[in-house]
């Protein structure tokens, strides 16, 4: 089979600070040295890019400075963290993995992680 399998958890609950973390694991059919990981958000059949990073195997995963994502890599596993989430960001987050180099190129699309975000209740004013 020439398809690359990507596994990610079905559901994740964001913290009260709007932070969600999940693992994206891919079964590499080849010995990739350059990998690109993209987090996509799917809502009402519309797909948008949340963040993306390209890394060399054995090196750290580096997102752009203004990205809402951070991550670390270990072998064929990527630990992804998305920050600054609010209730309106609840949705399906898809992990996309591309083995860019060396040939052949492989594409892997995960089934998506449903991230639930609950906005914290505002603290009531205290009278002292």
């Amino acid at each position: 089979c020439k398809a690359m399998h990507v596994a990610q958890p079905a559901v994740v609950l964001a913290s009260s600070r709007g932070i969600a973390s999940f693992v994206c694991e891919y079964a590499s059919p080849g010995k990739a040295t350059e990998v690109r990981v993209t987090v996509l958000r799917q809502a009402d059949s519309q797909v948008t890019e949340v963040c993306a990073a390209t890394y060399m195997m054995g090196n750290e995963l580096t997102f752009l400075d203004d990205s809402i994502c951070t991550g670390t890599s270990s072998g064929n596993q990527v630990n992804l963290t998305i920050q600054g989430l609010r209730a309106m960001d609840t949705g399906l987050y898809i992990c996309k993995v591309e083995l860019m180099y060396p040939p052949p190129y492989y594409l892997g699309i995960g089934n998506g992680t449903q991230i639930y975000v609950i906005d914290p209740e505002p603290c009531p004013d205290s009278d002292f």
Epitope: M4, V47, T48, T54, P104, L107, I109
Partner: antibody, heavy 118, light 108 residues
């Protein structure tokens, strides 16, 4: 408007060269991989070449390897195909296509005709 | 290289009837990586189905895709006059990206 517009096609003699361009608009060009696909008269679709987001990774069909070079300029939202040592069998309509976020070619240009004949 | 074989080469159907197009791969293709395109004379191809069964934006629900592994199907439930065209399947899970040779759907 989200679109791709090819240019640069024409009539060229065998052994000659041609440079095709594809101008992208209406989307963040650097967030997508890009491809060239061709279609010989009355024939099916044939993938020609691929280029990664930053232009560092490139792949080619065996039929054009060593003769064609794909490149992109993200600052200009443009994709290119330099075609050298052209042969009669390279005669085709050449399309640029966007590799969609989930992989399929979700946006195509209108195509530009390349005719290789003496 | 994954070779895609489409059948039949030509399908003659009357408007309003159902059309069933087949695409067979030389080796297993993950269903997430199989697409169908429609092409009319003088026009660029248009994405219809991706991920074997998901309709692209703006594609009417009379178009549906199914299948997994090596066998995939595009079904047009009730052919409209504008559906007479050539249809191509494609795999995009690994390089080289490959297309089937196409099925022409013509008016009977």
């Amino acid at each position: 408007e989200v679109q791709l517009v090819e240019s640069g096609g024409g009539l060229v003699k065998p052994g000659g060269s041609l440079r095709l361009s594809c101008a992208a608009s209406g989307f963040t060009f650097s967030s997508y991989t890009m491809h060239w696909v061709r279609q010989a008269p009355g024939k099916g679709l044939e993938w020609v070449s691929f280029i990664s987001y930053d232009g560092n990774t490139k792949y080619y069909a065996d039929s054009v390897k060593g003769r064609f070079t794909i490149s992109r300029d993200n600052a200009k939202n443009s994709l290119y195909l330099q075609m050298n040592s052209l042969r009669a069998e390279d005669t085709a309509v050449y399309y640029c296509a966007r590799g969609g976020l989930l992989g399929p070619f979700d946006l195509w240009g209108q195509g530009t005709m390349v005719t290789v004949s003496s | 290289e994954i070779v895609l074989t489409q059948s039949p080469g030509t399908l003659s159907v009357s408007p309003g009837e159902r059309a069933t197009l087949s695409c067979r791969a030389s080796q297993s293709v993950g269903s997430s990586y199989l697409a169908w395109y429609q092409q009319k004379p003088g026009q660029a191809p248009r994405l219809l189905i991706y991920g074997a069964f998901s309709r692209a934006t703006g594609i009417p629900d009379r178009f549906s895709g199914s299948g997994s592994g090596t066998d995939f199907t595009l079904t047009i439930s009730r052919l409209e006059p504008e559906d007479f065209a050539v249809y191509y399947c494609q795999q995009y899970g690994s390089s080289p990206w490959t297309f089937g040779q196409g099925t022409k759907v013509e008016i009977k």
